[in-house]
């Protein structure tokens, strides 16, 4: 079995303020079992954007239904983008752990740039 890879195919995405950003992410394997999380930024100060396992993320919707069997698409949409949302977004696979899930592998990141709303 090939080791899981996290694929973020878009190095950068440009979105107009007020629009919806789509951040694409797929994984290449069902193994290991565990959730996906999305972060803005890297390192200890990174900001959690979406956690498949738990939490409330009102601006975020998933592109695919993650409950469906064999789903490997963990792309998200972020609504009502503002300039404050600019940054690099990472799709991160976690491995089921006991008691806590453990970070397994990160995608390469997608840089989100925000274009000002035309006046």
């Amino acid at each position: 079995e090939e080791e899981l890879q996290v694929i973020q195919p878009d190095k950068s995405v440009l979105v107009a303020a007020g629009e919806t950003a789509t951040l694409r992410c797929t994984v290449t394997s069902l193994i290991p079992v565990g959730p996906i999380q999305w972060f803005r930024g890297a390192g200890p100060g990174r900001e959690l954007i979406y956690n498949q396992k738990e939490g409330h993320f009102p601006r975020v919707t998933t592109v695919s239904d993650s409950t469906k069997r064999n789903n490997m698409d963990f792309s998200i949409r972020i609504g009502n983008i503002t300039p404050a949302d600019a940054g690099t977004y990472y799709c991160v696979k976690f491995r089921k752990g006991s008691p806590d899930d453990v970070e397994f592998k990160s995608g390469a990141g997608t840089e989100l740039s925000v274009r000002a709303k035309p006046s």
Epitope: L30, V33, G34, K53, E54, G55, D65, K96
Partner: antibody
């Protein structure tokens, strides 16, 4: 961490119905399937059915499809399994279990609810 | 429906020895490169506990003396060096179609 807390033991007469509950915590209830499995005294495991709380999609074991109904209450993160027209051979421990990988497997289990059917 | 048949029904193994439990499916449980077989351990008075998923992958927190192998229709759960706490009933489960369980194998100490 993930917890599934089931309702207490029940004693029912033949022909009656029982509704067992399973309250989930430690994860987003709508993101993972819930399975129901039973085990008669001294016997093996028997899969009853499964439900996706996000859209109430269900799959039933043919043996139970006319007598069992699965439902969920997403406001309380609770799953229910109702079994009708009870017979003495329905006496069993009924388990709920959460599928963490959408693989139609059972990663986390409740402690079980003993249902006794006796006249 | 896929029928799973475990063998043996019961097994007695000395402490420190290898224990092997087999699970045969009535048709292939393989799909898209994965083998949809899972192994559970159940001790008296407790719910089952997932040990192995997709035939050969150790679940979180499971000691590495447990391993799973096989493909297609024939699968094996192996405990490389039996410990006293491994006394339990072991079940295989398939999910190539809707879930079904094997009948269980009772493992005891010789």
């Amino acid at each position: 961490q993930v917890q599934l807390v089931q309702s207490g033991a029940e004693v029912k007469k033949p022909g009656a119905s029982v509704k067992v509950s399973c309250k989930a915590s430690g994860y987003t209830f709508t993101n993972y399937w819930i399975n129901w499995v039973r085990q008669a005294p001294g016997q093996g495991l028997e899969w009853i059915a499964m439900i996706d709380p996000s859209d109430s999609e269900t799959h039933y074991n043919q043996i139970f499809k006319d007598r069992a109904t699965l439902t969920t209450d997403t406001s309380t993160s609770t799953a229910y399994m109702e079994l009708r027209s009870l017979r003495s051979d329905d006496t069993a421990v009924y388990y709920c279990a959460m599928d963490y990988g959408s693989l139609y497997a059972m990663d986390y289990w409740g402690r079980g609810t003993l249902v006794t059917v006796s006249s | 429906d896929i029928v799973l048949t475990q063998s043996p029904d019961s097994l007695a193994v000395s402490l420190g020895e290898r224990a092997t439990i087999n699970c045969r499916a009535s048709k292939s449980v393989s799909s898209s490169g994965y083998n949809y077989i899972f192994w559970y351990q159940q001790k008296p008075g407790q719910p089952p506990k997932l040990l192995i998923y997709l035939a050969s992958n150790l679940d979180s927190g499971v000691p590495d003396r447990f391993s799973g192998s096989g493909s297609g229709t024939d699968f094996t759960l192996t405990i490389s060096s039996l410990q006293a706490e491994d006394v339990a009933v072991y079940y295989c489960q398939e999910s190539r179609e809707l879930p079904t369980f094997g009948q269980g194998t009772k493992l005891e100490i010789k």
